[in-house]
Structures are given as C-alpha cells and as structure tokens.
Amino acid sequence: CTCVPPHPQTAFCNSDLVIRAKFVGTPEVNQTTLYQRYEIKMTKMYKGFQALGDAADIRFVYTPAMESVCGYFHRSHNRSEEFLIAGKLQDGLLHITTCSFVAPWNSLSLAQRRGFTKTYTVGCEECTVFPCLSIPCKLQSGTHCLWTDQLLQGSEKGFQSRHLACLPREPGLCTWQSLRSQIA
C-alpha cells in the first residue's frame, strides 16, 4: 500500500475529524470485518464538532488489520505521547489508514500546530494545495497553490509543509502564506 503523504492542510481539509489523542491500548481485531481498533484518549478536537454532534468523545480509532490493505500500525509504545490524528467518519466511527495524517504532536512545527488549531480551516473552502511532482507543473486555477516540497527536497517535511498554508488572498485567488504571520 503506497500513498504520497499529503500537505497537512490537505489532510485537515479532507478529513471529517481532526483530533489530538494518546494511544492507550493494544489493538483488538474484529474477526467479522478484520478491522482493528486502537483505544485512544482524546485530548483536543480541532475539526468534527458538527459531524459528531453530541457524541463528541472518541474512544477508538479503526483501521484495516492488515498492512496489505492500507492498515495503520501504531509503533510507539509511549502511552503518554500525543498524536495528531486526521481521519474519516464512517457510521460515527473514526477510521484511518496508512495514508492518513497521523503524527506525534511534538514532531509538528509551531506553524503546523497553529495551522491545525485555527488557520488551515480558513483555506478549506476556496483553496487547494496542488502537488507538483514533476517539472513542468503549472497552476490549474488561481485558487491553487503549487506544493513543491517533494520536488525540491524529496520530502513532504519541507518548508511549505512545515511553515505555510494556502489561504485566500482575495476572491478567486489563493497564495502561500506564512503561518508565523497569522495571529497566534
């Protein structure tokens, strides 16, 4: 199972639910579906209040129980470590895969933390982070921001991922903007 890691803003915008949580238990495999669930302790919710309604406490995260079908395997044994989890809601349950954005909160830059906390949401409706994987690549629309981290640095952990967000400059136009300059 292979996938290109998304820009964190794309992960935020394309997810139904974005939370901060600790993985607190050993995964359990459901033999009817061959999905596994990890017990989590949610500490913050950044997106999904409306989607969840009253059931605003997520206690488990679900993923295929096999690597070959994009199951997520949690490798950290530190139960006090917080993770940013961006996933999809299916029948009221939080689902993730290998391709989901799951990262230790401490590994995120301050700018990314700010993005997840308040800024990425501003760009969700109008703007699109457009991955540039090979030269030449050009903007398809004024609302697109060319994401060149992988092209220039061979890593999704480049400058645009760690420090920038694609935000509206004016109607019909989005540009890369520094998350440092956003109000904290």
Epitope: T33, L34, M66
Partner: antibody, heavy 113, light 110 residues
C-alpha cells in the same frame, strides 16, 4: 463445543484442482474470520489463506496467491478452499482454523504424478 | 518462512517445570495479544493449549500457562508428565501476513 471438520482431500496430479470444505459447528460461524493452515510431511505449520467473518476480505500467502481461492457460505456454516494449478510442494495436511484459536483434524492433499 | 523463533528442543524430568520461548517482532507477538500455543503428538492434529497469550481452553490442564513480555511469548509446563512429550508450536496474529508460526519445539520428557 467448537467443531471443525475438513473434507475434500485426496491424490491429485500436478496442475490439477481440488476443493476443500470445512463444516463448522458449536459457534456463530459468521462472527469469525476463518483460515486454512497446512503442514507438509515432517515440516512445520504454514498459514495459507484467511477470510473475514462477513466474507468481504480475503488474504493469501504469497506461495498460493493466484492459485488458491478461499470462500465461505455463512448460511451453511461452511468454509471452502479452491486449489488450482497444484504443485508437488502443495502436498500437506490442510487444517481449517477458526480465528486465532481452534483447528480441525485436517485433510491430506497429495500432489503427485 | 519461519517468522517466530522457538528453541528446536527442550527437555525436562517428570515433575519439573519447563518454559518454551517464542520471539517475534512488534508487528506480531509484541503488537497484539493474540498468541496461541499448540501441542502436536506424532501423526495427530495440533491441539490448542493456550490462546490470547494466557487463556486456557476448557479441558486443558492448569499445568499449562502462557505469558508475554515485549516481543517474546512463553509457554510454561509445570509438573511435567510423560504425556506432555510432543511438538509445541506458537502462533501469533501478524499485521503483515495474518498468521505466523514458530518453527516448533520438540519437548522430551526424560
């Protein structure tokens, strides 16, 4: 109590086909993933294939991928293994297994000319 | 492919206790509580002795116990008896390949 009874084994020529069956009783069949495990003469155990309780997901060992097909009929509490393009190295006792625990008594498959 | 490592053989005298180890990785033994142990006498089908790391099916003697620490699971047989002489296999759920097995351990009761 849990009971798994395999059938369908026998002698088959290389390149031939066989269909194994496993009749299950003593538990809610549709709630459990089922798998086939084999043991070549004098050798250890090898997982062959698995299927989710609903039948929606199937998995295969690399050694049988493209040749074997696992399926189930939850209305009949029966698990199947369709084995095509059989090779000498497929000779083994084939066991049907419930989830990660109970096994049947096995059925012998011999591939020889 | 033998994914889990077991000693090829262990031995003990009647009445003694023996332990068989089963070492895997974080994606099998270490990652899940789905380790089973099977006893196999020559010419017979494997018999479930322990499931889910430490649970005994009904009918299995309480002389058999299972445990796990990190990536290693263990089967302990106390008060060894002649009929315990057999091959023992560990099995674990595995995130990469579904089920993995140890190579088997031949237990000899001296």
């Amino acid at each position: 109590q849990v009971q798994l009874v395999e059938s369908g084994g026998g002698l088959v020529q290389p390149g031939g086909s066989l269909r194994l069956s496993c009749a299950a009783s003593g538990f809610t069949f549709s709630s459990y993933a089922m798998s086939w495990v084999r043991q070549a003469p004098g050798k250890g155990l090898e997982w062959v294939s698995a299927i989710s309780g609903s039948g929606g997901s199937t998995y295969y060992a690399d050694s049988v991928k493209g040749r074997f097909t696992i399926s189930r009929d939850n209305s009949k509490n029966t698990l199947y293994l369709q084995m095509n393009s059989l090779r000498a190295e497929d000779t083994a006792v084939y066991y049907c297994a419930r989830g990660f625990d109970y096994w049947g008594q096995g059925t012998l498959v011999t591939v020889s000319s | 492919d033998i994914a889990l490592t077991q000693p090829a053989s262990v031995s003990g005298s009647p009445g003694q206790s023996i332990t068989i180890s089963c070492t895997g990785t974080s994606s099998d033994v270490g990652g899940y509580n789905y380790v089973s142990w099977y006893q196999q006498h020559p010419g017979k089908a494997p018999k479930l002795m322990i499931y889910d790391v430490s649970n005994r099916p009904s009918g299995v003697s309480n002389r058999f116990s299972g445990s796990k620490s990190g990536n290693t699971a263990s089967l302990t047989i106390s008060g060894l008896q002649a009929e315990d002489e057999a091959d023992y296999y560990c099995q674990s759920y595995d995130f990469k390949t579904y089920l993995v097995f140890g190579g088997g351990t031949k237990l000899t009761v001296l």
